[in-house]
């Protein structure tokens, strides 16, 4: 339109904006490595850090893991987002007896009220199933409740409403994918680790604890027992390990109780962006060992500039142990340029480059 | 055991340039390559630069035609020329040697020096 003609003219003299056509606006122009939350930005808050897929941006503005609802036993709730976590949630029929940071560590079967009790509550994705004693004189023949007499107060005793544990049930306690038998007492009632014996005659404690070793009585040496691939974070909770099953990432350190896995990128490759505990984006290493490589004195005096190796592939170099077994990476996006100037004047060491000491520091 | 210190960052306006720093100790010849890396404020570790033992360079995207990377091998000392600088490269900037060895997790920011703060401010 003729009339957007010197708002467009004055927009693309602003190297910071840019004109959308599309809604005849100028824009602000997101920096670089930022990405726009909206159709046309117009002040830096509506520029955001792009993560990784499967990676969301945590509050402290770092590139997180999502975690994986893989497992046979969870459902994906939420989707990982680019500012929130995956969240999972047990399949339907189940309860979360140890929860995690946007998951369940264990998932169990509801229970199924045994005979003479009826449900209360029916389990959720959170809860077992409550059930109650069915009151005496009350059959499917009742119509109404009208016609069913409730027996007076002081006849019966009336239980209070709880889940059924497996003394009382024939219901189902295997996790989805075995394990060991765990006694269904309600998630917020946990005293014991599965598979421990009877807390009978220990002080009980939190949920999901469990000790370091057989914990003497009254003995402060208990801990928290998280999940496998989850550990036991700084504040407590029980958080996913990430995951290094990433083609261009290898272990560097195990999940442990206490800490997460470690994940770096494979040999022959250099991470260009962290992420914690990991690598968001790995890339070929671009430079060549200096005896395998091209002289840097021919480059210089062609002054050659050459781009980062395609996908998957080494600098043109002899394969060497270390270089050799890098997979396809992530979109490198190193570019590699002969600083010419650098390469006539700086003293040329006829050695290879130099290993460091064992501990790399 | 090697260290390094990194220095030369500051203050400076859009457009204006500085030179970085890394003088390194504890190597037994010229050095391996090395490596310059940058954590803006609630970022990630980000590799900018690297330069081999023999003097070749590679840049990121990002700050390829900005930024220059050279070394001193009799001083170990290795130097980051910034230009046309922006905003966004406002960080923490961090020389790590050996990359190809130690950079390969996920974090090589602080592990060797420091840093040196480059703020980039009108």
């Known amino acids: 339109f003729p009339q957007d003609r010197p708002f467009e003219d004055t927009c693309r003299g602003n190297p910071g904006h840019y004109y959308d056509k599309a809604v005849r606006r100028c824009c602000y122009r997101c920096p670089t490595g930022l990405f726009p939350t909206q159709q046309c930005p117009q002040r830096p808050a509506d520029c955001r850090k792009q993560c990784e897929p499967d990676y969301y941006l945590d509050e402290a503005g770092r590139c997180t893991a999502c975690v994986s609802c893989s497992r046979d036993d969870l459902v994906e709730k939420m989707p990982c987002a680019w500012n929130s976590s995956r969240v999972c949630e047990c399949q339907p029929g189940m309860f979360c007896a140890v929860s995690v940071v946007n998951s369940c560590a264990r998932c169990f079967f509801h229970s199924v009220c045994p005979a003479g009790m009826i449900v209360k509550f029916p389990g959720t994705a959170q809860k077992n199933t409550v059930c109650e004693p069915a009151s005496p004189g009350v059959s499917p023949a009742c119509a109404s409740p009208e016609n069913c007499k409730e027996p007076s107060s002081g006849t019966i005793p009336q239980a209070k409403p709880t889940p059924v544990s497996p003394a009382t049930s024939n219901a189902s306690t295997m996790p989805l994918r075995g394990g060991t038998r765990l006694a269904q007492e309600a998630a917020s009632k946990l005293t014991r680790a599965p598979g421990s014996p009877s807390s009978v005659g220990r002080p009980s404690s939190d949920p999901g604890l469990s000790p370091t070793q057989p914990c003497p009585q009254g003995s402060g040496d208990c801990r928290k027992q998280c999940e496998p691939d989850y550990y036991l974070d700084e504040a407590g909770r029980c958080t996913a390990c990430v995951s290094c099953s990433r083609d261009d990432l290898v272990e560097k350190t195990p999940c442990a109780w206490n800490s997460s896995r470690i994940c770096e990128c494979r040999p022959g490759m250099i991470c260009a962006t962290s992420a914690t505990n990991s690598c968001a984006r790995c890339v070929p290493y671009p430079i060549c060992a200096a005896e395998t490589g091209t002289k840097p004195q021919d480059m210089a005096e062609k002054d050659t500039t050459f781009e980062a190796p395609p996908v998957g592939t080494q600098p043109d170099c002899s394969p060497t142990p270390e270089n050799g077994e890098a997979p396809a990476s992530t979109s490198p996006t190193l570019s590699s340029l002969v600083d010419s100037q650098a390469s006539k004047t700086l003293p040329i060491p006829t050695s290879a480059p130099i290993a460091l000491s064992s501990t790399g520091k | 055991e090697v260290q390094l210190v990194e220095s030369g960052g500051g203050l400076v306006q859009p457009g204006g340039s500085l030179r970085l720093s890394c003088t390194a100790s504890?190597?037994?010849?010229?050095?391996?390559?090395m490596a310059w890396y940058r954590r803006a404020p609630g970022n990630e570790c980000e590799l900018v630069s690297i330069i081999s033992a023999d003097g070749r360079t590679y840049y990121t995207d990002s700050v390829k035609g900005r930024f220059t990377i050279s070394r001193d091998n009799a001083k170990n000392t290795v130097f980051l020329y910034l230009n046309s600088l922006q905003p966004e490269d406002t960080a923490v900037y961090y020389c790590?040697?050996?990359?190809?060895?130690?950079?390969?997790?996920?974090?090589?920011?602080?592990?060797w020096g420091p840093g040196t703060q480059v703020t980039v401010s009108s």
């Open positions: 790590a040697p050996d990359p190809r060895r130690n950079c390969r997790g996920g974090d090589c920011c602080g592990n």
């Open positions: 504890g190597f037994t010849d010229d050095g391996p390559d």
